[in-house]
C-alpha cells in the first residue's frame, strides 16, 4: 500500500523538515525559518511555538521539531507540553484571588503549587496522632491508642473538623 501511495502521491516522499510545495510542482521544499514538520508527507510546515512572557525556551525549534517551553522562576508548568504557567506559592500556602494565602488551620500544602488539603484524620483508621500537622505538613499517624504501652501517650491536638472550612476573606 505504501508503495502504491508513493507512486500516486509524490508528497509522501517528502521527509520531516520539508513540505510538499504545490507552488513548485510538488517538490519537497525545506521548511521556512521559524517553522517545522515533524513527520514526512506534510503539505505545510507548522509555525514554531514561541516561548514569551512567563514562558522560557527549554528546547529551540528545529526544522523537524517544535520548540519546548517551561516557566520562568516563580512559576510552574500546567497542561500538556507546558501550555500554561501558574504562579508558585510557598509551602503552607495556596493561590487564591487575593494571591498566595496561608493554609487554614487543619489543612496543609507541602508543595509550591496546588491547594491546601485537610490533615489526615488518624482516628478514622483507628490510629492516634503521633506528630501534629502544620500548614506545610500532614499529621503523622501512629499506632492505635489501644496498642500504646502503659504510661505512653500520644499527642492529641484539637481535632480538625471533618471538612475544614476556610476563613472568610
Amino acid at each position: 500500500f505504501e508503495r502504491t501511495r508513493s507512486l500516486q502521491d509524490p508528497c509522501s516522499n517528502c521527509p520531516a523538515g520539508t513540505f510538499c510545495d504545490n507552488n513548485r510542482n510538488q517538490i519537497c521544499s525545506p521548511c521556512p525559518p521559524n517553522s517545522f514538520s515533524s513527520a514526512g508527507g506534510q503539505r505545510t510546515c507548522d509555525i514554531c511555538r514561541q516561548c514569551k512572557g512567563v514562558f522560557r525556551t527549554r528546547k529551540e525549534c528545529s526544522s523537524t521539531s517544535n520548540a519546548e517551553c517551561d516557566c520562568t522562576p516563580g512559576f510552574h508548568c500546567l497542561g500538556a507540553g507546558c501550555s500554561m504557567c501558574e504562579q508558585d506559592c510557598k509551602q503552607g500556602q495556596e493561590l487564591t484571588k487575593k494571591g498566595c494565602k496561608d493554609c487554614c488551620f487543619g489543612t496543609f500544602n507541602d508543595q509550591k503549587r496546588g491547594i491546601c488539603r485537610p490533615w489526615t484524620n488518624c482516628s478514622l483508621d483507628g490510629k492516634s496522632v503521633l506528630v501534629n500537622g502544620t500548614k506545610e505538613r500532614d499529621v503523622v499517624c501512629g499506632p492505635s491508642p489501644a496498642d500504646l504501652s502503659p504510661g505512653a501517650s500520644s499527642v492529641t491536638p484539637p481535632a480538625p473538623a471533618r471538612e475544614p472550612g476556610h476563613s472568610p476573606q
Epitope: 500538556a80 484571588k97 489543612t107 496546588g114 491547594i115 491546601c116 471538612e163 472550612g165 476556610h166
Partner: antibody, heavy 117, light 108 residues
Framework: QVQLQESGPGPVKPSETLSLTCAVS?????????WSWVRQPPGKGLEWIGE???????YYNPSLKSRVTISVDTSRNQFSLKLSSVTAADTAVYYC??????????WGQGTLVTVSS | SSELTQDPAVSVALGQTVRITCQGD??????ASWYQQKPGQAPVLVIY???NRPSGIPDRFSASDSGNTASLTITGAQAEDEADYYC???????????FGGGTKVTVL
C-alpha cells in the same frame, strides 16, 4: 507530553461494579499532580467523581463516596476507578484527567460505559 | 443542585460578542476555570486563573469576575466556537471540585 487513555470492559449489568483504568503516558503518575475521574451522562453535564495522589490519598464526590474507590498503581503508571452497585443512572462517558490546583489540564478521550441488563 | 450555576443556553450572531456567567459562593475566594466541549470530544481548558489562556487558545476568549460571579466572554464569535462551556471551581469543602451545569453556545 502527558497523555491519558481510559480503558474498561464495556457494558455493565445493574448492581454490578464498574471498573475502569486510566493509563498515563509521556509522564510519571508520581509527579506533583492529582489524578481525577469525571463523568458525563448522555446529554448532560460534567460531574467530578473523585481524585487520587500517587501516595494513595483520595478525595471523593460526597454524593458518590459510598460507592466509589479510586486506586493508583505507580509501577504501571496508571490509576483506576471502581463504582459499585451501578444503575442505569451511572451510564455515562467516563473521563480521566490530570488535576493541578483545580485545573483539569489534561484529559483522556473518554469511554462510554452503559449499564444495562 | 449544583454549587455553580450557569445559564443553560445562549446564542450569538457570527462575529458578535457573547458573555457566559457562572455563579457560586466559592467564586468569592477562588477563580473559576472554563472548559469548552464539542460533541463527541473531551473538554478542553480555555481559561484558568484571573484571565489566563493556555497556548493555542485564541485571544477572543477572555474572563472576568466580580464577587461570586465569573464570566467568560467570546469577542467576535466564530462558527467553531459553537460548543458547551463549563465552569469549574471548588465546592464548599474547599478541597473538592465541582462543575457548573454548562452553557450551550450557538453561533447563528
Amino acid at each position: 507530553q502527558v497523555q491519558l487513555q481510559e480503558s474498561g470492559p464495556g457494558p455493565v449489568k445493574p448492581s454490578e461494579t464498574l471498573s475502569l483504568t486510566c493509563a498515563v503516558s509521556g509522564g510519571s503518575i508520581s509527579s506533583s499532580h492529582w489524578w481525577s475521574w469525571v463523568r458525563q451522562p448522555p446529554g448532560k453535564g460534567l460531574e467530578w467523581i473523585g481524585e487520587i495522589y500517587h501516595s494513595g490519598r483520595t478525595y471523593y464526590n460526597p454524593s458518590l463516596k459510598s460507592r466509589v474507590t479510586i486506586s493508583v498503581d505507580t509501577s504501571r503508571n496508571q490509576f483506576s476507578l471502581k463504582l459499585s452497585s451501578v444503575t442505569a443512572a451511572d451510564t455515562a462517558v467516563y473521563y480521566c484527567a490530570r488535576e493541578d490546583g483545580g485545573i483539569m489540564d489534561v484529559w483522556g478521550q473518554g469511554t462510554l460505559v452503559t449499564v444495562s441488563s | 443542585s449544583s454549587e455553580l450555576t450557569q445559564d443553560p443556553a445562549v446564542s450569538v450572531a457570527l462575529g458578535q460578542t457573547v458573555r457566559i456567567t457562572c455563579q457560586g459562593d466559592s467564586l468569592r475566594r477562588f477563580y473559576a476555570s472554563w472548559y469548552q466541549q464539542k460533541p463527541g470530544q473531551a473538554p478542553v481548558l480555555v481559561i484558568y486563573g484571573k484571565n489566563n489562556r493556555p497556548s493555542g487558545i485564541p485571544d477572543r476568549f477572555s474572563a472576568s469576575d466580580s464577587g461570586n460571579t465569573a464570566s467568560l466572554t467570546i469577542t467576535g464569535a466564530q462558527a467553531e466556537d459553537e460548543a458547551d462551556y463549563y465552569c469549574s471551581s471548588r465546592d464548599r469543602s474547599g478541597y473538592r471540585w465541582v462543575f457548573g451545569g454548562g452553557t450551550k453556545v450557538t453561533v447563528l
